[in-house]
Interface confidence: low
């Protein structure tokens, strides 16, 4: 139904969805304190920028009694039931901030009208591709995609003389919520990676993990898997591995590799992280003492997200343009705003664009090194360390086929 | 109008810390970057290095290990330390206004620091 | 780093007259973060030009910014007395940021 906008006259307002189900199981405390420090930066640009005008943000909260699973499976009926008491109450702000999960968020997406503005941290699936006014503000699963069909087919380095063409996927179902949809991602059949890849299988169990690690047979020395170094380790343990087997770990929201007193474990020798590369941010910030690596990223999704309607709500105040406009509620992409750690584009379709860095362990060191940076703007990968320290054969990425080619 | 305004001692011993503070009016320093650069006479500009509200601060690589710059956003001020300095960092050294992707639109009028025994 | 290299060192025009000033990056400036910036004798740089091609904020019109890739140009179309000076260029497409050695513009 049609629900009026507080958005005009001066005053307006964000409406942040509250959500128990969640992507990261962040206390909702964090949250409100990351949307409460974005707003007092907004006040203060829009000040600076003689726009003497009322932001506040409206936390919408759901009764949590039915909901209450925490992780994302039970959140599609809570996104909905956030939209029905938005509309029972008939107020909603000039933006929506809030669903976090895939599912609620396509499904809120396809049952509300496209005159305002959907702003999300995380929505990671591919269900919420190029969706007209949704903005995803942390890496979705299609950016990840992009990158490993560019480095498959990457053979040009020195490091990299091959182009890969097949792969196994370990997903067993565990997974946080965007290690699930970066991993469905690989597995659909239809998408760019499978498309892209001559073979590509989908390992569901523990044992089938660990039997191609030495088997003879395998189809493909390169396997993908989303989660942390423990998570890996749980796995793996301190199995033989074939020389010739590369793990790539998908790890992006954890900057732990990144401290100075970090040494790589010895089951991480055959493994590539691939990471984003670290901001330093909220360090001194209240909201963020007592968070995890990859909480600081949700957080900050979300103060990011105050910024940029911020941002968008200057633009056009300054124009004299409307606010509850399905203009303004379209805008929200192909453009660069002052994040809280620094520029934060978005692409042609909302989705933020950002740097993604390839890290390998260095067998002299025991350090994470950078190996490679890949930026998701522009869909290209620049080589950082020209002579790797690998613990491949001659410091060379392997075949992906053992026997095809020399090794 | 924003405003930028250095202050600081204008000679400085070799091996000591040179130290600067810029103080913004006309506007808040928590919307914005904030940089340092410097000129030696009758050269050309040099980008120390800048800071952000966050505390996210971004160094010229060549000057990085001996930098820290702070920000104070309760007195609208920003800061420059730079340790162990010797005659070759003899300049007159600008603070300005960093539009978040890098380039400078405010700029202070500039102060010259002498590094001399 | 980017090396950005700026000719000519010293051009000698009269006022009315057209100048162009070029930038030469060592490699290419990403989405085109140029700016150029115009230094007087004892005053800091003013910024004239952003994202190679935006004016900034109060500056005449007939400044203009141009170029890509490695390749940038300052033009003043028609010169004014009160437009002899230094001009530099600044990337800030990769860190560090850096500047031009600067060109300066002289009355002939």
């Known amino acids: 139904s049609q629900v009026s906008q507080n958005c005009h006259n001066g005053s307006y307002e964000i409406s942040v969805l509250m959500m128990g189900n969640s992507a990261f199981a962040e206390p909702l405390k964090n949250l409100e304190d990351a949307v409460n420090e974005g707003l007092e930066i907004v006040r203060g640009r829009l000040q600076n920028a003689g726009l003497n005008v009322t932001v506040n943000a409206t936390f919408m909260y759901s009764d949590g009694l039915i909901h209450n699973s925490g992780d994302c499976r039970s959140s599609t009926c809570e996104g909905l039931d956030l939209l029905r008491k938005i509309s029972n109450a008939q107020r909603m702000g000039c933006v929506l901030i809030g669903p976090s999960c895939t599912y609620s968020t396509f499904q809120m997406y396809l049952d509300t009208e496209l005159s305002y503005p959907m702003i999300s941290a995380g929505s990671f699936g591919l269900s919420c591709d190029y969706k007209e006014t949704l903005t995803r503000l942390m890496s979705p699963a299609r950016k990840l995609m992009y990158f490993l069909v560019n480095f498959w087919k990457t053979n040009d380095l020195p490091f990299k003389t091959y182009s890969w063409s097949t792969s196994y996927v370990y997903k067993n179902g565990t997974e946080t919520e965007d290690c699930f949809w970066y991993l469905n991602a690989l597995e659909a059949s239809v998408s760019y990676f499978s498309h892209e890849l001559g073979f590509k299988v989908v390992l569901r169990q523990d044992k089938e993990f660990q039997d191609i690690l030495m088997d003879h047979n395998r189809k493909s020395n390169v396997i993908i898997m989303c989660g942390g170094p423990e998570f890996l380790y749980k796995l793996k343990g301190d199995r033989a591995v074939a020389e010739d087997i590369v793990i790539i770990l998908v790890d992006l929201f954890n900057d732990q590799y990144f401290e100075d007193n970090v040494t790589a474990p010895d089951y991480m020798k055959n493994v590539l992280v691939l990471t984003l590369s670290p901001g330093n941010s909220l360090l001194n910030s209240s909201f963020s003492r007592n968070l995890s690596p990859t909480k600081r990223d949700f957080a900050l999704a979300y103060l990011n997200g105050i910024l940029l309607f911020g941002h968008m709500l200057k633009i056009f105040l300054e124009n004299g343009e409307n606010i509850t406009t399905p203009k303004f509620a379209h805008a929200f992409r192909n453009l660069t705003f002052e994040g809280y750690d620094g520029p934060v584009t978005l692409d042609d379709w909302g989705d933020v664009d950002s740097t993604m860095v390839l890290l390998y362990t260095s067998v002299d060191t025991k350090k994470y090194k950078v190996l490679l940076t890949y930026d998701t703007h522009v869909n290209k990968t620049y080589p950082v360390d020209m002579s790797p320290t690998f613990t491949w054969k001659n410091s060379k990425l392997p075949n992906d086929i053992t026997g095809r080619g020399p090794q | 109008q924003v405003q930028l305004q250095e202050s600081g001692p204008g000679l400085v011993k070799p091996s000591e810390t040179l130290s600067l503070t810029c103080t913004v009016s006309?506007?808040?320093?928590?919307?914005?970057?904030w940089s340092w650069i410097r000129q030696p006479a009758g050269k050309g500009l040099e980008w120390i290095g800048r800071?952000?509200?966050?505390?996210?601060?971004t160094f010229n690589p060549s000057l990085k290990s001996r930098v820290t710059i702070s920000v104070d956003t309760s007195k609208n001020q920003f800061s420059l330390k730079l340790s162990s300095v010797t005659a070759a960092d003899t300049a007159v050294y600008f603070c300005?206004?960093?539009?978040?992707?890098?380039?400078?639109?405010?700029w202070g009028q500039g102060t010259l620091v002498t590094v001399s025994s | 780093e980017i090396v950005l290299t700026q000719s000519p060192g010293t051009l000698s025009l009269s006022p009315g007259e057209r100048a162009t000033l070029s930038c030469r990056a060592s490699?290419?400036?990403?989405?085109?973060?140029l700016a150029w910036y115009q230094q007087k004798p004892g005053q800091a740089p003013r910024l004239l030009i952003y994202?190679?091609?935006s004016r900034a904020t109060g500056i005449p019109d007939r400044f203009s910014g141009s170029g890509s890739g490695t390749d940038f140009t300052l033009t003043i179309s028609r010169l004014e007395p009160e437009d002899f000076a230094v001009y530099y260029c600044?990337?800030?497409?990769?860190?560090?940021?850096?500047f031009g050695q600067g060109t300066r513009l002289e009355i002939k």
């Open positions: 600044q990337q800030y497409g990769s860190s560090p940021s850096t």
């Open positions: 490699q290419s400036v990403s989405r085109s973060y």
């Open positions: 300005a206004r960093d539009r978040y992707y890098g380039y400078l639109d405010y």
């Open positions: 994202d190679a091609s």
């Open positions: 800071i952000y509200i966050s505390g996210r601060t």
């Open positions: 006309g506007g808040s320093i928590r919307s914005y970057y």
